[in-house]
């Protein structure tokens, strides 16, 4: 069971300081942006992180949403990352959900975060380069200290 606590507005960056945004095709991508670019591209660069308390002691659970015309929420259904048109719910009556990720500090790097899928244990949000695009994907952690699964989260309130 997951009960919502509150939400905040955030900019999410990978460790190369590229900014996460949702493109016109609703794809989550990373791109180099100045602070001015980041502001100009809002609301596509501003993510609503809704925090949830897990009824099991597994940590801080979050959903990641974006509000362009409508609110879309990040999902990892079938281990494929996509945005689905839905509001983050007040309650999720299950122990796993495709839209819930566990947000934790990276040990030894308190300002860096990682997001583990609640549906697929050991799978994390990651940045991966595919041709000329830097995509947000779901990736199995295969090595300690993997920088691709680490992010910074900056409050925008």
């Amino acid at each position: 069971y997951f009960g919502k606590l509150e939400s905040k507005l955030s900019v999410i960056r990978n460790l190369n300081d590229q900014v996460l945004f949702i493109d016109q095709g609703n794809r989550p991508l990373f791109e180099d942006m100045t602070d001015s670019d980041c502001r100009d591209n809002a609301p596509r660069t501003i993510f609503i992180i809704s925090m949830y308390k897990d009824s099991q002691p597994r940590g801080m659970a979050v959903t990641i949403s974006v509000k362009c015309e409508k609110i879309s929420t990040l999902s990892c259904e079938n281990k494929i990352i996509s945005f689905k048109e839905m509001n983050p719910p007040d309650n999720i009556k299950d122990t796993k959900s495709d839209i819930i990720f566990f947000q934790r500090s990276v040990p030894g790097h308190d300002n860096k975060m990682q997001f583990e899928s609640s549906s697929y244990e050991g799978y994390f949000l990651a940045c991966e380069k595919e041709r000329d695009l830097f995509k947000l994907i779901l990736k199995k952690e295969d090595e300690l200290g993997d920088r691709s699964i680490m992010f910074t989260v900056q409050n925008e309130d």
């Epitope: 069971y1 009960g3 919502k4 606590l5 992180i49 949830y52 308390k53 002691p57 009556k93 308190d110």
Partner: antibody, heavy 120, light 111 residues
Framework: EVQLVESGGGLVQPGGSMRLSCTAS????????MSWVRQAPGKGLEWVSG????????YYADSVEGRFTISRDNSKNTLYLQMNSLRAEDTAVYYC?????????????WGQGTLVTVSS | QSALTQPASVSGSPGQSITISCTGT?????????VSWYQQHPGKAPKLLIY???HRPSGVSDRFSGSKSGNTASLTISGLQAEDEADYYC???????????FGTGTKLTVL
């Protein structure tokens, strides 16, 4: 202006019951988890109980689990704490609080507290 | 759930700096960046000084700063002033069955 106003405190005998209320104004009550925090005379702060935005998730300190029940009515912007089987060690000022978990826009707010005295 | 551990008291002279520690576990302070610090004067409700480890709400003096290393968070007050004399509490989100946990509290005396 944000306000949290507690009511319902007073004197109660050991083993008795009491219900605290907290009326919120000045922010969107339904968007935030709420908590009760208490402070015994001359002692430190103790988190007592919390409730999720929709009321479906309820959380308790070990010291009150099974005796206290937290609830909320978002249509009335009101938070409740039902306290049963009260003990002398439950004597404290009870604060209604919206702790600032994150950098959320509405801030961190506390009521002025209501005193609960458990004594025969 | 156990309270976070703080020193019972600290003291300093006006103009000096002091640091108050707050030690928890990987289930609270060490696992999350949701650590807050509160100041409480006698008979008053707590006032937020720091949230998310090191962020200051608007209106709070920049003499107050927060940091974290591992399972220990710290509050530093620089340029101590007489009005800083108060009790200070840390708090953290916890992944245990409860939601928050407070520190044991530290009484600051300005000499």
């Amino acid at each position: 202006e944000v306000q949290l106003v507690e009511s319902g405190g007073g004197l109660v005998q050991p083993g008795g019951s009491m219900r605290l209320s907290c009326t919120a104004s000045g922010f969107t009550f339904s968007e935030y988890a709420m908590s009760w925090v208490r402070q015994a005379p001359g002692k430190g702060l103790e988190w007592v109980s919390g409730i999720s935005t929709g009321g479906g998730g309820t959380y308790y300190a070990d010291s009150v689990e099974g005796r206290f029940t937290i609830s909320r009515d978002n249509s009335k912007n009101t938070l409740y704490l039902q306290m049963n089987s009260l003990r002398a060690e439950d004597t404290a000022v009870y604060y209604c609080a919206k702790p600032w978990l994150s950098g959320s826009r509405s801030g961190d707010f506390w009521g002025q507290g209501t005193l609960v005295t458990v004594s025969s | 759930q156990s309270a976070l551990t703080q020193p019972a008291s600290v003291s300093g002279s006006p103009g000096q700096s002091i640091t108050i520690s707050c030690t928890g576990t990987s289930s609270d302070v060490g696992g999350y960046n949701y650590v807050s610090w509160y100041q409480q004067h006698p008979g008053k409700a707590p006032k937020l000084l720091i949230y998310e480890v090191s962020h200051r709400p608007s209106g709070v003096s920049d003499r107050f700063s927060g940091s974290k290393s591992g399972n220990t968070a710290s509050l530093t007050i620089s340029g101590l002033q007489a009005e800083d004399e108060a009790d200070y509490y840390c708090s953290s989100f916890t992944s245990s069955s409860s939601l928050y946990v407070f520190g044991t509290g530290t009484k600051l005396t300005v000499l």
